[in-house]
């Protein structure tokens, strides 16, 4: 809002400061120079002079402006000034300095900050098809990696594309080896709302970053198709005879999200006893991963049996494909 | 520049549009609401229509413009739109679109792309035990990833530990659909200098850059074990009787660098033809990758038999294991 | 953001003519191949055709060779799939895809869109 000054038993509205700088094109490219326009509006007509500063330094002093135009009782002009991109992408400082009835009046700008800012990361994983389909109780983590420790607390923030309600979902921190800090939140979900296609979104906030973090999930698109497995074990080895590898292999499966398990006894083996792959593109379409599991002569004595399974949202009937093998066949 | 058109009889000079966006704090912060203004000039007066587009869609029709201001014979006037930051923020692309005379003019801008990408990532890799050993032409690789694109060029020099000289290779730069630079430098190595330890060092400078990244590399210390190779062919299936898939498991290895081919009819198959796993901890010591290679009739009925072969600095006596496999045994 | 949008879908009878739409943003698209596939009811997906990133070269499938055009509007980040002679056996869901590497054949792509739908019934 203009205030309305009297001085020297004379009544007058100052001008208002802003700078409107050149836009990047549709790429979001910088142009190769930078244009900013200092939009001088509202004042009473009268002299005016404008200096351009770059970091504080005089760069244009008595800068021309066009003739002012007037809206009723009161004038608008306007300043330019053209700068090298590379000054600008430099984190210059630029200052548009309006003199008027013997005062300053003034706006800076400066490149906006990068809005995600290098170092740190946040990632959003879907929720397992086991968990999705099986034990139904699937959640999406939010994990922020890199962050520099300071005192204040990193705020991990859900929402939901539908406006639905998120409950509060407090977030752990960790500090790394590294001297960073990783922070977690896990949202439970419900099966339906994730297959009928809810987004849910996750935002992090904190004083050191220049803007908030977003991450947003939904449930993927493009056409399904069911996982084959096939399963081997590698043959009986002079020097490690109490010991064999069970290799699953699960492939074609569209789209990449699967859960693979281990099974022995009926019991299913804890996760950490194998290593799954990454999901990679088959030649053809679709997805594989491999598994590898290390069993014990105790084990394949016990029962000669080990399954290995794939939980997968295109696998009917139940979300489930699995195939078993025997460590000693025919024996 | 402006051309000067003739239209039934009539010439006319038309406009020409620019946008200009309000500017970030001189923290580099983004306003809470972003002010779009469209300069519309140089035109021969006569009656516009502005249209403010968001992604293509239409946001704001028969946007109003304050009277034309003239200069001579041409007229000027402007447009403004106000978004949410959060849309700026979520990179919509705006346009300005003007009808004029039957024709459009437009410009279109979105939120500059960060300058100082965020992960601006500087890798170095070993070279190949294959490369190594076998072909005997290892070289390493200098890869920089995530740069935002810029007039200035990367500069990526190399360097050895022991001070001998290396050689100037000049790097290649790839635009990433992102729009984000990656840069790659390819430096051959001596064998035997790899094998004695030789130190080789990366140093990566930019303008914007704050710093030099610098990545060194040397041959991996630590016990050794060359690795165990198993393969597998998956059986005949009803609806893709004509491909087969093979698995090769490759295990217990150290250290993690190992070279992995196919070899069908004593010719090596591209690499491109088998998909390999990055190498991942066994739960003992030692290494795993896993190896899959689709196979066609067409192969097999010429010769059934397809090898799976490790190339390991520890496997003796000539760095190679390998194991053989029959799509159809016993046939 | 990759995303990629797919209309023009609906209802035909056999021997009947649509154009399917697929608007994509998030990308330079003039920059990447782009392709078709197609996933009937309870089957596995299928790669319908494909085109290079200038609209230079297209590739199609022998199943819809002949019968189905593709084609592309860079200045309007639009990829198209006319499809005439339209038979049952046509009737799936359509998708856009474009990959970061390989988008011109058969292959698991990095990106689709949501999908629309085609059926061909009298």
């Known amino acids: 809002v203009n205030k309305t000054f009297g001085v020297s038993s004379r009544n007058f509205t100052p001008p208002t400061v802003k700078i409107l700088q050149s836009s990047c094109d549709d790429d979001g490219h910088f142009p190769p120079t930078i244009q900013l326009l200092c939009l001088i509006s509202g004042y009473t007509p009268g002299a005016i002079n404008v200096t351009w500063l770059e970091n504080g330094q005089v760069m244009k002093v008595n800068s021309p402006t066009p003739p002012a135009t007037q809206e009723g009782e009161l004038a608008s002009t306007q300043s330019e000034f053209t700068l090298a991109q590379k000054h600008w992408l430099s984190d210059r400082t630029y200052t548009c300095q309006v003199t008027y009835q013997g005062t300053t009046y003034n706006d800076s700008t400066k490149k906006c900050a990068d809005s995600n800012p290098r170092g740190v990361s946040a990632y959003l994983s879907r929720p397992s098809p086991f968990d999705l389909f099986i034990s139904k109780s699937p959640t999406i983590t939010c994990l922020v990696v890199d962050l520099a420790p300071s005192k204040e607390t990193v705020n991990l923030t859900w929402s939901r594309a539908s406006g639905k309600p998120v409950p509060h979902i407090p977030a752990t921190e960790k500090k790394q080896r590294n001297g960073t800090l990783t922070v977690t939140s896990i949202l439970p979900v419900v099966t339906q709302d994730w297959i009928e296609g809810e987004t849910y979104q996750c935002r992090v906030t904190h004083p050191h970053l220049p803007r908030a973090l977003v991450r947003s999930m939904t449930k993927t698109s493009g056409p399904r198709a069911a996982p084959e497995v096939y399963v081997f074990a590698t043959p009986e080895k002079l020097e490690s005879r109490d010991k064999r590898t069970l290799a699953c292999l699960i492939q074609n499966f569209m789209p990449e999200d699967i859960s693979v398990q281990w099974l022995h006894s009926d019991v299913q083996l804890p996760d950490a006893r194998h290593s799954v792959t990454q999901p990679r593109k088959t030649k053809g379409s679709g997805f594989f991963v491999f598994s590898r599991l290390e069993v014990t002569k105790a084990e394949w004595e016990q029962k000669d049996e080990f399954i290995c399974r794939a939980v997968h949202e295109a696998a009917s009937p139940s979300w489930i494909v699995q195939q078993a093998v025997s460590v000693n066949p025919g024996k | 520049v402006n051309k000067t058109f003739g239209v039934s009889s009539r010439n006319f000079t038309p406009p020409t549009v620019k946008i200009l966006q309000s500017s970030c704090d001189d923290d580099g912060h983004f306003p809470p609401t972003i002010q779009l203004l469209c300069l519309i000039s140089g035109y021969t007066p006569g009656a516009i229509n502005v249209t403010w587009l968001e992604n293509g869609q239409v946001m704001k029709v028969n946007s109003p413009t304050p009277p034309a201001t003239q200069e001579g014979e041409l007229a000027s006037t402007q447009s403004e739109f106000t978004l949410a930051q959060k849309h700026w923020l979520s990179d919509r692309t705006y346009t300005c679109q003007v009808t004029y005379q039957g024709t459009t003019y437009n410009d279109s801008t979105k939120k500059c792309a960060d300058s100082n990408p965020r992960g601006v990532s500087a890798y170095l890799s070993r070279p190949s035990p294959f490369d190594l050993f076998i072909s005997k032409s290892p070289t390493i690789t200098c890869l920089v990833v995530d740069l935002a694109p810029s007039k200035e060029t990367v500069n990526l020099t190399w360097s050895r530990a022991s001070g001998k000289p290396v050689p100037h290779i000049p790097a290649t730069e790839k635009k990433q659909r992102n729009g984000t630079l990656t840069v790659t430098s390819i430096l051959p190595v001596v064998t035997q200098d790899w094998i004695e330890g030789e130190t080789y060092q990366c140093r990566v400078t930019h303008p914007h850059l704050p710093r030099a990244l610098v990545r060194s590399m040397t041959k991996t210390s630590g016990p050794r074990a060359a690795p165990e190779v198993y393969v597998f062919a998956t059986p005949e299936k009803l609806e893709s009787r004509d491909k087969r898939t093979l698995a090769c498991l490759i295990q217990n290895f150290m250290p993690e660098d190992i070279s992995v081919q196919w070899l069908h009819s004593d010719v090596q198959l591209p690499d491109a033809r088998h998909s390999v796993t990055q190498p991942r901890k066994t739960k003992g010591s030692g290494f795993f990758v896993f190896s899959r290679l689709e196979v066609t009739k067409a192969e097999w009925e010429q010769k059934d038999e397809f090898i799976c072969r490790a190339v390991h600095e520890a496997a003796s006596p000539s760095w190679i294991v390998q194991q053989a496999v029959s799509v159809n045994p016993g046939k | 953001e990759v995303q990629l949008v797919e209309s023009g879908g609906g209802l035909v009878q056999p021997g009947g003519s649509l154009r399917l739409s697929c608007v994509a943003s998030?990308?330079?698209?003039?920059?990447?191949?782009m392709s078709w596939v197609r996933q009937a009811p309870g089957k596995r997906p299928e790669w319908v055709s494909a085109?290079?990133?200038?609209?230079?070269?297209?590739y199609y499938a022998d199943s819809v060779k002949g019968r189905f055009t593709i084609s592309r509007d860079n200045a309007k980040n639009t990829l198209y799939l006319q499809m005439n002679s339209l038979k049952p056996e046509d009737t799936a869901v359509y998708y856009c895809?474009?990959?970061?590497?390989?988008?011109?054949?058969?292959?698991?792509?990095?990106?689709y869109g949501q999908g629309t739908q085609v059926t061909v019934s009298s």
């Open positions: 085109i290079n990133s200038g609209g230079g070269s297209t």
């Open positions: 998030g990308f330079t698209f003039g920059s990447y191949d």
């Open positions: 895809a474009t990959d970061e590497d390989y988008a011109l054949g058969p292959n698991e792509y990095d990106y």
